[in-house]
Interface confidence: low
């Protein structure tokens, strides 16, 4: 038996910038029951506050909801292990809300064959920035990204689209089904997942529609 | 897992033809182009041309038409390329490569030497 | 055809060291589709070549974020970061834009 070992915090994201979430590695435990505690303080204050929610996020975690979020803040985190042999206390971490969004992926893929006159196909991949952003206010700038391969290749290919919420995707094979998704990132912030997998078949015979 | 496996080296006289072979294997042969390409000793890599194993429609380097002749066989997923009246100068290592998505080759044979020498 | 000019023909570098290979096509390489067709390839001794980047700066599966691969036009360039014992070899760069498709002369990488 001995005092707990020393805890890491693993990361914290922000789907919004509005609520965010810290989680942590427990260190070991020493063989005791430990509990662990979150505290935070806020760049230029003196107070030092415990983590408002454990429960929200799942074990080892803290949700900072609306209520105790400030984009304009740094905070300065620390978790700490407790059992009866004693404590140990993690290597802070400073989280500006800013930095750490991590959106939904994009909605509302939408998958269509079209022909060029010199009778070239290609794909025209569309979608829409996910529900919580705020990208039409500036509040937001998100980038993205779209990945495709055909159904039965081994690799991704991946086009970065920019700003852009449209992309043609050129060379792709008649009678060939492929499989598209798409992902986002906010300037200073992480990528989303990949987004819901569709799917569209290119046609071997495609002609053109007036 | 992808694979090209080439026929192995061939020593041939001035005026006569090779025919090298490339066995596909781990994907569908159909659905993917195969180019070939040389390289002489010590030299760069040289486009020969390529073929659609679907329909067998060919585009050639216009160096390599009317000397080159690329084939498919589907039943066994087997491209080849033949080259005739053999000079010299086509003593290279010939490797077939499959397309990724279009026209880039992210899959390469081993590589068939072939030496031209009287 | 579209010759292919790289430079420079050899290059010596240190392990932990940055290395650039400059690729100069005759003519533009932008395709009608707005796609660019510019490939690198790296054949390692006894090898046959591999693909690095596709596209210009698609950094194939499997390569290390060390490569990368940037231009437009005529103008190509493709960096390594942090040159490697296991990167030395020959780089072609490639233009798969017009027929025929054609390659560069190579660049041959080795190790100080």
């Known amino acids: 038996q001995s005092p707990p070992g020393k805890p890491e915090i693993h990361k914290c994201r922000s789907p919004d910038k509005e609520t965010f979430t810290c989680w942590w590695n427990p260190g070991s435990d020493g063989g005791l029951p430990t509990n662990y505690s979150l505290t935070y303080s806020k760049e230029g204050e003196k107070n030092t506050y415990e983590c408002p929610d454990y429960k929200t996020s799942g074990p080892n975690s803290c949700f900072f909801s609306k209520q105790y979020t400030s984009i304009w803040k740094i905070y300065i985190i620390t978790v700490n292990a407790t059992n009866e042999m004693g404590s140990s206390t993690s290597d802070p971490l400073y989280v500006d809300v800013t930095y750490i969004v991590e959106p939904e992926p994009p909605r509302n893929l939408t998958l269509e064959v079209k022909q060029l006159k010199d009778k070239k196909t290609y794909l025209w991949v569309k979608w829409l920035p996910p529900t919580i952003t705020d990208v039409k206010t500036g509040w937001f700038t998100m980038e993205y990204e779209i990945r495709l391969k055909s159904e039965e290749a081994d690799e991704w290919e991946i086009h970065f689209t920019g700003h852009q919420t449209q992309f043609k995707v050129f060379d792709l094979y008649p009678g060939q089904k492929y499989l598209v998704q798409t992902r986002c990132k906010p300037d200073h912030g992480y990528w989303s997942r990949w987004g819901q997998e569709k799917s569209i078949e290119i046609p071997n015979d495609f002609t053109l529609k007036d | 897992e992808v694979q090209l496996v080439q026929s192995g080296a061939e020593v041939k006289k001035p005026g006569s033809s090779v025919k090298v072979s490339c066995k596909a294997s781990?994907?569908?042969?159909?659905?993917?182009?195969i180019h070939w390409v040389r390289q002489a000793p010590g030299q760069g890599l040289e486009w020969i041309g390529e073929?659609?194993?679907?329909?067998?429609?060919?585009n050639y380097n216009q160096k390599f038409k009317g000397r080159a002749t690329l084939t498919v066989d589907k039943s066994s997923s087997t491209a080849y390329m033949e080259l005739s009246s053999l000079r010299s100068e086509d003593t290279a290592v010939y490797y077939c490569g499959r397309s990724f998505f279009t026209n880039w080759f992210a899959y390469w044979g081993q590589g068939t030497l072939v030496t031209v020498s009287s | 055809d579209v010759v292919m000019t790289q430079t420079p023909l050899s290059l010596s570098v240190t392990p932990g060291q940055p290395a650039s290979i400059s690729c100069r096509s005759s003519q533009s390489l932008v395709h009608s589709n707005g796609n660019t067709y510019l490939h690198w390839y790296l054949q390692k001794p006894g090898q046959s070549p591999q693909l690095l980047i596709y596209?210009?700066?698609n950094r194939f599966s499997g390569v290390p974020d060390r490569f990368s691969g940037s231009g437009s036009g005529t103008d190509f360039t493709l960096k390594i970061s942090r040159v490697e014992a296991e990167d030395v070899g020959v780089y072609f760069c490639s233009q798969s834009t017009h027929v025929p498709f054609t390659f560069g002369g190579g660049t041959k990488v080795e190790i100080k």
């Open positions: 781990g994907y569908t042969f159909t659905s993917y182009w």
């Open positions: 073929i659609d194993p679907s329909d067998s429609y060919t």
């Open positions: 596209k210009v700066s």
